[in-house]
């Protein structure tokens, strides 16, 4: 049975030009976290193993950095950043959690966090 | 291009080691990881491991875990899987293949030729 | 683990007709929350390493033919070759790419009736 919930930084803002982390937090179970992925609806981004440690997308190498903790960072963010992102938490026993963000990349120099959210 | 070349075929006898080796061409070698599937004769594909050539961290199936070891070594661009304990189960064609991300997804997207090992007394 | 199942094991066509195959998986290689199934296909010929045909399920890789397609979700996937021709007499493996350790079914070997 899945217990466990993903909190998440919900909908948040950052400048072009910019960086901004992606964190999400696993609670509620006592499952073994395998492996973090972290995707866009369509674009892996980046992998966290436990044994493997992590795999940045070749793609995305330039732009994104590992961490911290589980999280991912992107650097040098455009427009085209805007979007969901998605933390996909592999675990054992439990199976797959999936946790929302989504980022609004601003052309202005004002970007505020939203409000943290849970997902079940 | 990119190409995996592997080590020529091997005979050994029971009880030795092997190790096989996958030199990687034409892409950044420490930006993909590669991935090791054993093909006994007659029969389908099982896969043995894989490493991350950026971290040096590896993964293995249960199965092989305690005698299969896979190395990177970046300086030569070339992967490496050495088998312990062999026996004659062990005698498969093993491949290397590098993991590319197509989409949201980790594909094997380049193999190389494949290495016959054969276990022998 | 997740185990992958095939069938058939093999399977004989006549040229230009239509040839199945299934693969079920033990767990679902569905994640609803992205709607992405992780699920690939290769072709292996005689002699030669595998090779990519399919993935996410239902995309082809570049420059495969469109006589092949995938299909199916969670659990239960096709792959379709909608006219068989000569030279796709081959073993055909689905494999799941949600999880490590990255399984394979047990293969499907397609032959000519």
């Known amino acids: 049975m899945m217990t466990g919930t993903i909190e998440t930084t919900g909908n948040i803002s950052a400048e072009k030009g910019g960086s901004i982390i992606l964190q999400c937090h696993l609670s509620s179970t006592t499952a073994q976290v395998t492996q973090v992925n972290w995707e866009q609806q369509d674009q892996l981004l980046a992998i966290c193993n436990a044994d493997l440690g992590w795999h940045i997308s070749p793609s995305f190498k330039d732009r994104v950095a590992p961490g911290p903790g589980l999280g991912l960072t992107l650097q040098s963010l455009t427009v085209n950043d805007t979007g969901e992102y998605f933390c996909i938490y592999h675990t054992y026993p439990d199976g797959t959690y999936t946790g929302r963000i989504f980022l609004e990349v601003l052309e202005s120099s004002v970007a505020e966090h939203g409000a943290r959210f849970q997902i079940p | 291009q990119v190409q995996l070349v592997q080590s020529g075929a091997e005979v050994k006898k029971p009880g030795a080691s092997v190790k096989v080796s996958c030199k990687a061409s034409?892409?950044?070698?420490?930006?993909?990881?590669i991935e090791w599937v054993k093909q006994a004769p007659g029969q389908g594909l099982e896969w043995i491991g894989v490493?991350?050539?950026?971290?040096?961290?590896?993964k293995y199936n249960e199965k092989f875990k305690g005698r299969a070891t896979i190395t990177a070594d970046k300086s030569t661009s070339t992967a490496y899987m050495e088998l312990s304990s062999l026996r004659s189960e062990d005698t498969a064609v093993y491949f290397c293949a590098r993991t590319g991300v197509y989409g949201n997804f980790l594909i094997f997207d380049y193999w190389g030729q494949g290495t016959t090992v054969t276990v022998s007394s | 683990d997740i185990v992958m199942t095939q069938s058939p094991d093999s399977l004989a066509v006549s040229l230009g007709e239509r040839a199945t195959i299934n693969c079920k998986s033990s767990q679902s290689l569905l994640n609803s929350g992205i709607q992405k199934n992780y699920l690939a296909w290769y072709q292996q010929k005689p002699g030669q390493p595998p090779k990519l045909l399919i993935y996410?399920?239902?995309t082809r890789e570049s420059g495969v033919p469109d006589r092949f397609s995938g299909s199916g979700s969670g659990t239960d996937f096709t792959l379709t070759i909608s006219s068989l021709q000569a030279e796709d007499v081959a073993v055909y493996y689905c494999q799941n790419d949600h999880r490590y350790p990255f399984t394979f079914g047990g293969g499907t070997k397609l032959e000519i009736k």
């Open positions: 490493i991350n050539p950026g971290s040096g961290g590896s």
């Open positions: 034409g892409y950044a070698f420490t930006n993909y990881l």
């Open positions: 996410g399920a239902s």
